[in-house]
Every structure is written in C-alpha cells, then in structure tokens.
C-alpha cells in the first residue's frame, strides 16, 4: 500500500513538473505574441500613415477620378513625348470620354491657355485608322478634326477644346496619364 501511495505521489509530482513546464512555455509564448503584436501594430500604423500621407498622384500631377495627368513644360516631337511619359511610368494621354476631355481642356485653360498638347493618338500608316497606344480606337465623338494634309506620320493633339491632327515631327507640349494610387485608408 505504501508503495502504491509513493507511486501516486511520484506521478503527481511528474504531472506538476509538466504543468509548470507548460505554464512556462505558455508565458514565453504569450510574451512572444505580445512582442509580435506590438511589431504588427507598429507596422500597420506605419503603413497606414504612409498610405495616408502619400497622395494618389505625384507632385505637379493633376488628379481626376482614377487618373493622374502631367502637363509638360517642354516642347518635343510626338515620339519623344511618348518616351518622356513612359520614363515617368505613364503614357501619353488617352481620352476615354467627353467628361475626361472636358476636364482636360478645362484644366489646360486654367494652367496654360491655348497651346498644342500631344496626346497618345496616332494614325495607322496602312489603314489610316486612328488608334490610341493600347491599340483601341477612339470613340466617334473623339476623332481628330482633319487638319493635317501631311504625307508624313500623323498624330493627335489637343488645343483649346478640340482634338486635332498634325505631322508627328512637329514640336508641341504633351500630356502624360497614369493611374492614381488607390488609398487603402
């Protein structure tokens, strides 16, 4: 009987040691979790504040809906304009609607006045079709008025509230467009 009691006591002591070990592990785990939580919260706060501080468009760009626009301060031919936009992570302006056209022409009136600005529209040499740089055709209301009788390459530009066409090798200002950053706040 004494042996039986002694065995039970030993078993209980072993159990107690295991529980103490488990408690120690749990405390350690809890401390680790708290540290991780702290790190996660700090990371989240940093991310949120940087997202809050970063504007949807870069400096000197104008926002309208989900687009950012940059109006150049230099003249260049159409190809150089396209390259300049690409290097900024954008492309020459692609006008999707009358609303966008109105916004652009309204903004230009406020910023610069009545100058010529290249957009991302060019005429296919073979078919004579007008195409945006992504290969899509402009909507019927946004086809350039035929102003260019040039035998050379013909590209589209905006002046006042009109879309016009000209030899791609003439010098004009240009407008770049890219997606605005989505604010996650």
């Amino acid at each position: 009987k004494l042996l039986q009691v002694s065995t039970i006591a030993m078993q209980q002591q072993e159990k107690l040691i295991q529980q103490e070990r488990a408690l120690l592990n749990f405390t350690e785990w809890k401390r680790s979790c708290a540290l991780q939580m702290k790190y996660c919260q700090a990371f989240m706060q940093n991310s949120l504040s940087s997202a809050h501080n970063s504007s949807p468009c870069p400096n000197n760009w104008i926002q309208n809906r989900e687009s950012c626009y940059y109006v150049s301060e230099i003249w260049s031919i159409w190809h150089t304009s396209q390259e300049n936009c690409l290097k900024e992570g954008s492309t020459l302006l692609q006008i999707e609607s009358k609303e966008e056209m109105d916004f652009i022409t309204g903004s230009l009136r406020k910023i610069k006045g009545s100058y010529d600005y290249w957009v991302g529209l060019s005429q296919d040499g073979h078919s004579g079709r007008w195409l945006w740089q992504d290969g899509s055709s402009p909507s019927p209301g946004l086809l350039p008025a035929e102003r260019s009788q040039s035998a050379n390459q013909v590209c589209g530009y905006v002046k006042s509230n009109s879309l016009l066409s000209s030899n791609c090798s003439t010098w004009k200002y240009f407008i770049c467009e890219k997606y605005a950053l989505r604010s996650s706040v």
Epitope: H79, Q82, K87, G135, Q153, C168
Partner: nanobody, 115 residues
Framework: QVQLVESGGGLVQPGGSLRLSCAAS????????MGWYRQAPGKERELVAR???????NYADSVEGRFTISRDKDENTVYLEMNTLKPEDTAVYYC?????????WGQGTQVTVSS
C-alpha cells in the same frame, strides 16, 4: 529583366545595304518604343530611328528615305533596313527600348562602310 540582342552588323561598301535586327526578351510593357541610336568614334550618340508598339516610325533627317525601321510585335524584334550606305554611317549601332519606368540598351553592333 529585359535583354536586347543585336545582330547584322558588318563591313559593307558605299552604296551597299545591311539589315540590323534586335531581339528583346524578358518582361516588356505593352506600350513601348523601340529603336536604334548610333555612335561614331569621337562623336556623341545620335538617334537613327525608332518605332512604337503600334508601328509608328520616326527617323533622323540624315537617314530619312535611306533607312527603314520595322518591327515584329509578336516576336518583340525591331529591324533596321539600311540602304545606300555612306562612309558617314560608320558607327556602333545600339538597339534601345523604352517601357514603363524603364530604358534598356543592347551591347551594340559595328557597322563599317568603306571601300
């Protein structure tokens, strides 16, 4: 990463022809401009010709009417057909590509026009 590999350079007599090729591989944005610059010894690098993803070309005045740029959009390859070559066309010809936030250059191919 984008890689540009040029080929087709060589020695040719004045009045002769050459066809340069430049193959682009890697992740290329759908809207881009590809083209050719050249650099003669002791001179600055100058634009020769370029072409958009939709095939709209543009030429330097010195080569207009003699050189023709074209591209195979599916193969991401740009070609420069050079006719009526002159000694002043002698240079290293570099292929380049401008994509979104990126500009890439090939290693260059030597073109020598001499009798």
């Amino acid at each position: 990463q984008v890689q540009l590999v040029e080929s087709g350079g060589g020695l040719v007599q004045p009045g002769g022809s050459l066809r340069l090729s430049c193959a682009a591989s890697g992740s290329i944005s759908s809207i881009n401009v590809m083209g050719w610059y050249r650099q003669a010894p002791g001179k600055e690098r100058e634009l020769v010709a370029r072409i958009t993803n939709l095939g709209l070309p543009n030429y330097a005045d010195s080569v207009e009417g003699r050189f023709t740029i074209s591209r195979d959009k599916d193969e991401n390859t740009v070609y420069l057909e050079m006719n009526t070559l002159k000694p002043e066309d002698t240079a290293v010809y570099y292929c380049y590509l401008v994509g979104l936030k990126a500009e890439y250059w090939g290693q260059g191919t030597q073109v020598t026009v001499s009798s």
